[in-house]
């Protein structure tokens, strides 16, 4: 009922075709020392098989190069095969600033990240850099900040601003798209001792983002001319029973608690959504919860309001929801929402339902509520058990991109990019990657390549072309040189 026939058409010429990776752990030393050692060795191949240094001989060395990092070489090979125009990856805050402040800057880590960006640019691949990407097992904070109460401590927001400033300064000449924080609206999974913990941590995350954005706007934008936002987890919600009013209300409430919670203060009013504040207050009045959203001062509202240059959404699936009154003072119970798994739907091994039309509804809802701004889908993908012919991923990509195209062509949503999640999978984690954990390519890569080179799903005889300046053209000489580099 919700699906509409596929459309034929193309995305705009300046559309970003991306792939997302989570945190890149920096290599501490270049893994190819053979070019920086000035000594000559003789290899005793038939005897003890050891290298013996020849004294008194010094060879000319060459300067260290970015591709001395084995990890970078691997990434470049994968990215070159993906044919993407953009690569989204996250820095490791704890590696860059182990002490949590600028007293000890890990220059080697910053050099590594600069190498990732600059080598990508040689392939015609621009970076979208995420400053802070908390993973649920590990908060990704520098140890001293973690031990000082993490995001429950307002000073963490100031520490984040200092870290962001360092990254803007060191990488900003090469990076034009920044994400401050990935999915702050999902940190409720960690700060879940009470609703007040959740809302307090969220408040400090909002402030941290706003401080970083204001710093960029004031100090770096004039020269670097980049754009800064934060990525929100943004699954769509549908009423489990479309004939029940309470389910419709629950679906809207899910969106308010999940997306508007962060979007409203930043994109619109500088304050939390009235619907969310009122719902929590009403439960509080009835003695069903002791939670309360923080009261914002006028100064805080001014600080938060308007601190986004674009809207960044991570969208994976659609959830079917119903109303269920829950007691307790935690974020999950404050929403009064129960999720239903529809077993008739095509789903992944981690039970992510494939519901393509949800992304179009989401984009329409965002546009309707927050205005006609540039929107990037900064992560979207599915786990697929297959190690070679990942048909579920191909189906997912094709259908979800169709719905994004409808949002652009028909709903006139200003969609600027789609970043597939993710580049390579991690061992013993759900298989979201286009490459296996030992870097073997899957067949979905060719599918994504085809969509990228066609700029979507064009008519057979489509004459639509982009001028050279608009379209990202691959430099074959650069590619050749990169592949031949040691």
């Amino acid at each position: 009922k919700e699906s509409t026939p596929d459309v034929q058409g193309q995305f705009p010429c300046d559309f970003s075709w991306g792939v997302t990776e989570s945190v890149l752990k920096p290599e501490s030393v270049a893994s190819s020392p053979q070019f920086s050692d000035p000594h000559l060795y003789v290899w005793n191949a038939t005897g003890n098989r050891l290298l013996h240094r020849v004294e008194g001989v010094r060879l000319k060395t060459r300067p260290a190069q970015c591709t001395d990092f084995v990890n970078i070489k691997k990434q470049l090979e994968m990215l070159a095969r993906m044919k993407v125009t953009h690569y989204r990856f996250a820095l490791d805050w704890a590696s860059v600033l182990p002490t949590g402040n600028l007293s000890a800057v890990n220059r080697q880590a910053l050099r590594y990240y600069r190498c990732v960006v600059s080598e990508g640019l040689k392939l015609g691949i621009s970076a979208m850099v995420t400053l802070y990407y908390p993973t649920h097992a590990h908060l990704g904070l520098p140890e001293p900040l973690l031990h000082a109460d993490g995001w429950l401590n307002p000073s963490t927001a100031e520490a984040f601003q200092a870290y962001a400033g360092l990254c803007f300064q060191e990488l900003g000449d090469l990076v034009k798209l920044w994400i401050t924080i990935n999915e702050p609206n999902r940190l409720s999974d960690i700060y879940n001792r009470s609703g007040n913990d959740t809302y307090g941590a969220a408040h400090n995350l909002l402030v941290a983002h706003a401080l970083a954005w204001r710093l960029y706007d004031r100090q770096f934008r004039p020269s670097q001319r980049g754009a800064v936002s934060l990525s929100l987890h943004a699954d769509w919600a549908e009423p489990a029973n479309p004939y029940a009013d309470s389910h419709w209300r629950a679906a809207e409430r899910f969106l308010q608690f999940e997306i508007a919670w962060f979007a409203e203060p930043l994109f619109k009013t500088g304050d939390y959504p009235a619907a969310m504040r009122e719902y929590i207050a009403s439960k509080h009045r009835r003695g069903l919860s002791s939670s309360a959203l923080p009261r914002l001062t006028e100064a805080e509202r001014r600080l938060l309001k308007g601190t986004v240059d674009f809207c960044a959404l991570n969208h994976f699936t659609t959830r079917f929801v119903m109303h269920e009154q829950l007691a307790g003072s935690r974020y999950d119970s404050d929403r009064d929402i129960q999720f239903l798994q529809d077993i008739t739907r095509l789903s992944s091994p981690t039970r992510l339902a494939v519901i393509p039309w949800g992304v179009r509804k989401l984009l329409r809802w965002v546009r309707r509520n927050y205005g006609d701004m540039d929107i990037y889908i900064t992560a979207s993908g599915i786990d697929d058990q297959a190690l070679e012919d990942d048909r579920l991923r191909k189906y997912y990509l094709g259908k979800y991109l169709q719905e994004v195209l409808k949002a652009y062509l028909i709903d006139k949503v200003r969609i600027k990019g789609y970043y597939a999640f993710k580049l390579a999978e991690e061992k013993s984690k759900p298989r979201f990657g286009f490459f296996t954990s030992d870097f073997k390519a899957k067949s979905s890569i060719q599918f994504y390549n085809k969509v990228i080179s066609s700029r979507g799903f064009p008519f057979e005889n489509s004459s639509s072309r982009c001028s050279q300046t608009q379209e990202n053209t691959e430099c074959t000489v650069c590619l050749f040189l990169v592949q031949k580099k040691p």
Epitope: K1, E2, T4, P5, V7, G9, Q10, P12, C13, D14, R364, R368, D372, L409, I410, D411, K412, R414, R455, S464, R465, C466, Q470
Partner: antibody, heavy 116, light 107 residues
Framework: EVKFLESGGGLVQPGGSLRLSCAVS????????MSWVRQAPGKGLEWIGE????????NYTPSLKDKFVISRDNAKNTLYLQMSKVRSADTALYYC?????????WGQGTLVTVSA | DIVMTQSPATLSVTPGDRVSLSCRAS??????VYWYQQKSHESPRLLII???QSISGIPSRFSGSGSGSDFTLSINSVEPEDVGVYYC?????????FGGGTKLEIK
Amino acid sequence: EVKFLESGGGLVQPGGSLRLSCAVSGIDFSRYWMSWVRQAPGKGLEWIGEISPDSSTINYTPSLKDKFVISRDNAKNTLYLQMSKVRSADTALYYCARPSPALDYWGQGTLVTVSA
Amino acid sequence: DIVMTQSPATLSVTPGDRVSLSCRASQSISDYVYWYQQKSHESPRLLIIYASQSISGIPSRFSGSGSGSDFTLSINSVEPEDVGVYYCQNGHNFPYTFGGGTKLEIK
């Protein structure tokens, strides 16, 4: 204030050609899709077609695809409709409008009369 | 192409009446219907998007409903300035066809 100002209408002979223009002010023209709609005297509205912000996508109503060409010049904030092989059935008031996605801003229209 | 059929063609009403204008699509178009009002010698004006969502600046007496293939524009308490022709439009897929219009006149 948002303004859409159509021009270029007038009397044209059957089989002839005409280029209509729509000058836009008050919005960031280069960021928006634009449409043409026409209305024959005493009749209803007919959607002609639309063009994307970067001109890479242009959609037409199938019956008019071969005789009308929509284009735009973002530097001049202007939308165009090139009409060719006109017939008396093309006599109408031609409006430019912004689809976002419904047509929320309209010009006053320019009248095209096809007559020998 | 999706055909949009409006009824009635003409509607004569008394100020203060509640009126309903109907629009039927030749196939299901979810909630992709837009309503416009066109007064004599004026350009059309957008009233409702996505079948039921109101537009800022439009009087609250105008409301829309429907989903699938049957849609209704309601005017809660008709005022003399509401005279004109009302059009529905398919916004589901191109070509974005219009209905033939319903002319609203005051008795």
